[in-house]
């Protein structure tokens, strides 16, 4: 509660997560024209990346292009990119949907369909559906540690959210522990009012605020956080904004002389800690 | 404007940024001694990095060190660097300016110039002026989408940029689409008062700055972003305090079971949003 | 000191930072069953990682586990983790310490001791102490500058803490150079009361704090930073709570057509940059 | 579904040399471990050598430094070099892999075997 006799100060904050937990991982794996049931298991190392720490990301899902070299090949087939002849192929146009540079020239896609060749990384990305259930949907079960260090300089006082108290194998719960900073991935979408599972297919932000009302003076003092969860990312969002969460990134390799990459669209959770709050004192 | 009646709070915000365009490069490759023109294109997963929410880098330049492997070699001649004896080679010593430590001993670099020998990443790094005009100067064409999702948690109070009356084929322009939140990276240069073209050869850092000015008073409500842009990186800093905006990174891989890697010095820009702003209410 | 007649504005800051070292790595290397001492020298692209602006890292210790591939072998044999039949083994459990998926079989894990076998990354990682002294201990001789660009726009004023006068070979020092903004990272945790080999073993985190005290009226400007730091993460945390700073990162590679990767538990100091403080005008 | 085929035993010299091969086929996505083992005649059947996904190998001490054992993944295939044969080598050689199923566990699957003949 607003104490107007006190001298209010915002927080300065510092956070570092930690992660855990493991998912295995069936897909259909197309190998040599044959498909098979392929299965994996992804650690920390595989589905997360180190990111500053205020944000930490989960991947949940994704799709790869494997093999990819800089060549000549038609471009995929979306609505409105198939031709007919060359005439409907502009050389040296760069479509912003489309991932190469036209050479003016039609080409066929496959038996059926004909679009315009392009200079990218071939063949180009196939732009198919996240795959639904999402390939790490069991991330759910996973943990996360969260440690903030917080500062009143004007107060000279500082504080974190992991007391010497605590017990390090707690997990967060609103009413039985509310202080306990490990969360399980999908009791924060729970408490946010989230479906884990939906969300996990194209991806998303989610926000753990974590807010200290800090009450510093000797005769009243009181200041511990109050952690509360809310979904970042506009679920009702118009498909040309780009809904969920998703970003590509490539595994760069060589061989026989000629550089390959795999292209990974990767889905996820991006989970940001927005810490707020003042100190006050008399 | 000032609003003394009302209650103040500073806003909570989270930043998503998607990066769209690609790049036709040309530049000399030098392979077995012959130098032809290599050409490629940069997709996004080539150029940009998965970075946290409030800040995004797209590479413009880069200069490539190829083939790297621990051993011994001369070091770069740069000036005050040469040596005519291996008096002038401290066994053991680490010039801050150097890549390598020195073993003592001078040695030649080429027909006419001899430099301290190094134990360090050879052939050491070549410290030549990055390309001019910057390889991926056509990155001025590409586009940003900015979804910014804020929070005045004292007044409950939850909106973002991107409504859902808005087109997602816009481009932002300060007279005509000033809700817009795609935006052409020249385009925010212009607005900046600044030459893309120029800055994408050593790179740089840019801001750009959405403003929350908040009315949340049901009779006079009001809450849209302000977005504006401006240069964070001094372009007329001295040498020695590394002008512009680039980091080193490496892809390392394995070659007759020995280690190498390929360091790349990646000019680009770095945007930094800057959300600020504050909600009032009676 | 508070002027009660004054606007006062929080700041909005931009970082940028440039670490400055390279480190000489001794270490034992195994290959084919004979252990070698190996020497490597490591520099930024190999021990620091881009990350976004007010925040940096500096890996100062590791712990590699190379040539892993995605099979069943035998889990670590951590405490309580040993078998001696194939009832203590739980078909398709996760044990939130292991690294893989049990498949129900007790096999041996070396000549004394059988684990339970998992479906992993294998060989899977051993739970071994980090080195210690670290690996990457000369990091305390690294400097790093820091740049920052501050903005009060309801004041629109700017400022940055290198000015136009400043000499880029100078080193932060409390008294004879308070203003300087290249800072030796020994010297960081000198200040700040800490032991930088100490805490270069399990890694931590380093506030720098820049605070802005900006009186902004002509008749009496001033608006310089002060630097100061303080250690960020918990030294006496227990170690259920993950005390120090690592996360795990993988490099992946093919060999005989199967995927494997060597993945690599980096230690390091995080350093984060806190900017704060007010301008404030009549 | 799953099809183990062994080839490459015969009769051979003491001091001689044999390769044995063995093709997997079917709709394997993962093999994890590879291994021979061998059967005398009245006697129970025993390990000579495996080889797990990532290329490490076990050998009986009776055949160490003798044979090789090695992968092919692209190929489905196992190879086992056996050089300096013994009469005491002489047994039905079997080829044995194994493979992780989510949800199943670990499943085994064996060859038919072929004949090794160590004599003069």
């Known amino acids: 509660s607003d104490k107007l006799y006190q001298r209010k100060e915002p927080v300065i904050s510092s956070v570092h997560t930690k992660v855990k937990g493991i998912a295995e991982v069936t897909e259909n794996v197309t190998e040599g024209g044959v498909t098979k049931l392929g299965h994996s298991i992804f650690d920390t190392a595989d589905y997360t990346f180190p990111l500053q720490g205020n944000s930490f990301f989960v991947m949940t899902n994704y799709v790869k292009s494997e093999g990819q070299v800089q060549t000549l090949c038609p471009e995929y087939p979306r609505r409105g990119a198939q031709c007919s002849s060359d005439r409907r192929c502009k050389k040296g146009w760069m479509d912003p949907q489309s991932k190469g540079i036209q050479t003016g020239r039609c080409v066929p896609y496959d038996k059926t369909r004909k679009t315009c060749e392009v200079s990218a990384w071939c063949p180009t990305e196939e732009e198919k559906e996240a795959p639904r259930p999402a390939l790490l949907r069991s991330a759910e079960n996973f943990t996360v540690l969260i440690k903030n260090n917080i500062h009143f300089p004007g107060h000279n006082y500082t504080t974190r959210n992991i007391l010497p108290t605590m017990n390090g194998s707690c997990t967060f719960h609103k009413t039985w522990d509310p202080q306990c900073s490990i969360f399980r991935l999908g009791d924060i979408f729970q408490e946010a009012g989230e479906n884990f599972t939906e969300v996990a297919v194209q991806g998303g932000i989610m926000g753990i605020e974590i807010y200290w009302d800090c009450n510093l003076d000797s005769w009243s003092h009181h200041c511990r956080p109050r952690y509360s969860f809310r979904r970042l990312d506009d679920k009702n969002m118009d498909e040309s904004f780009v809904p969920g969460y998703n970003f590509r990134y490539a595994k760069y390799y060589k061989e026989n002389n000629v550089e390959k990459r795999t292209l990974i669209k990767a889905f996820g959770i991006r989970f940001d800690i927005l810490v707020f709050g003042t100190g006050g004192k008399f | 404007s000032d609003k003394l009646y009302q209650r103040k709070e500073p806003v909570i915000s989270s930043v998503h940024t998607k990066v769209k365009g690609i790049a036709e490069v040309t530049e000399n490759v030098t392979e077995g001694g012959v130098t032809k023109l290599g050409h490629s294109i940069f997709d996004t997963a080539d150029y940009t990095f998965p970075l946290q929410g409030n800040s995004f880098f797209v590479m413009t330049n880069y200069v490539k060190s190829e083939g790297q492997v621990q051993t011994l070699c001369p070091e770069y001649p740069r000036r005050g660097a040469q040596c005519s004896s291996d008096r002038r080679c401290k066994k053991g010593w680490m010039d801050p300016q150097s890549k390598g430590i020195q073993t003592g001993r001078c040695v030649p670099y080429d027909k006419t110039r001899k430099t301290c020998e190094v134990s360090a990443w050879c052939p050491t790094e070549e410290e030549k002026e990055a390309p001019r005009p910057a390889l991926l100067r056509s990155a001025e064409n590409f586009t940003v989408l900015i979804k910014n999702n804020i929070h005045f948690p004292g007044h409950n109070y939850t909106t973002r940029n991107i409504l859902p009356t808005m087109n997602g084929s816009c481009t932002f322009h300060k007279t005509w689409d000033p809700q817009c939140s795609i935006f052409r990276l020249g385009d925010i240069f212009q607005e900046a008062g600044e030459n893309f073209t120029e800055v994408a050869v050593q790179g740089g850092i840019m801001g750009i700055e959405i403003y929350w000015d908040c009315n949340l008073d049901s009779w006079s409500h009001h809450c849209r972003p302000r977005y504006s842009f401006r240069r964070l990186d001094d372009k007329n800093m001295d040498e020695s305090f590394v002008p512009g905006y680039n980091f080193r990174y490496a892809k390392y891989y394995k070659e007759n079971n020995v280690e190498k890697r390929t360091l790349i010095k990646a000019f680009g820009i770095r945007f930094d949003i800057l959300v600020f702003g504050t909600g009032g209410k009676f | 000191s508070d002027k009660l007649y004054q606007r006062k504005e929080p700041v909005i800051s931009s970082v940028h930072t440039k670490v400055k070292g390279i480190a000489e790595v001794t270490e034992n290397v195994t290959e084919g069953g004979v252990t070698k001492l190996g020497h490597s020298i490591f520099d930024t692209a190999d021990y620091t990682f881009p990350l976004q602006g007010n925040s940096f890292f500096v890996m100062t210790n590791y712990v590699k586990s190379e040539g892993q591939v995605q099979t069943l072998c035998p889990e670590y044999p951590r405490r309580g983790a040993q078998c001696s039949s194939d009832r203590r083994c739980k078909k398709g459990w996760m044990d939130p310490q292991s690294k893989g998926i049990q498949t129900g079989r007790c096999v041996p894990y070396d000549k004394t001791r059988k684990t339970c076998e998992v479906s992993a990354w294998c060989p899977t990682e051993e739970e071994k102490e980090a080195p210690r002294p670290a690996l990457l201990r000369s990091a305390e001789n690294f400097t790093v500058l820091i740049k920052n660009n501050i903005h009060f726009p309801g004041h629109n004023y700017t400022t940055r803490n290198i000015l136009p006068t400043m000499n880029g070979s100078c080193t932060f020092h409390k008294t004879w150079d308070p203003q300087c903004s290249i800072f030796r990272l020994g010297d960081i945790f000198q200040e700040a009361g800490e032991n930088f080999t100490e805490v270069a073993v399990q890694g931590g985190i380093m506030g720098i704090e820049i605070y802005w005290d900006c009186n902004l009226d002509s008749w009496s400007h001033h608006c310089r930073p002060r630097y100061s730091f303080r250690r960020l993460d918990d030294k006496n945390m227990d170690e259920s709570f993950v005390p120090g700073y690592n996360f795990r990162y993988a490099k992946y590679y093919k060999e005989n057509n199967v995927e494997k990767r060597t993945l690599i538990k980096a230690f390091g100091i995080r350093f984060d940059i806190l900017v704060f403080g007010t301008g404030g005008k009549f | 579904e799953v099809q183990l085929v062994e080839s490459g035993g015969g009769l051979v010299q003491p001091g001689g040399s044999l390769r044995l091969s063995c093709v997997v086929s079917?709709?394997?996505?993962?093999?994890?471990?590879m291994g021979w083992y061998r059967q005398a005649p009245g006697k129970q059947r025993e390990l000579v050598a495996t080889?797990?996904?990532?290329?490490?190998?076990n050998y009986a001490d009776s055949v160490k430094g003798r044979f090789t054992i090695g992968r092919d993944n692209a190929k489905n295939t196992v190879y086992l070099q056996m050089n300096s044969l013994k009469p005491a080598d002489t047994a039905v050689y079997y080829c044995?892999?194994?493979?992780?199923?989510?949800?199943?566990?670990?499943?085994?699957?064996w060859g038919r075997g072929t004949q090794v003949t160590v004599s003069s």
């Open positions: 044995n892999i194994d493979s992780y199923i989510i949800g199943a566990g670990v499943r085994d699957y």
């Open positions: 079917g709709s394997m996505y993962r093999i994890d471990n």
């Open positions: 080889v797990t996904r990532g290329d490490i190998t």
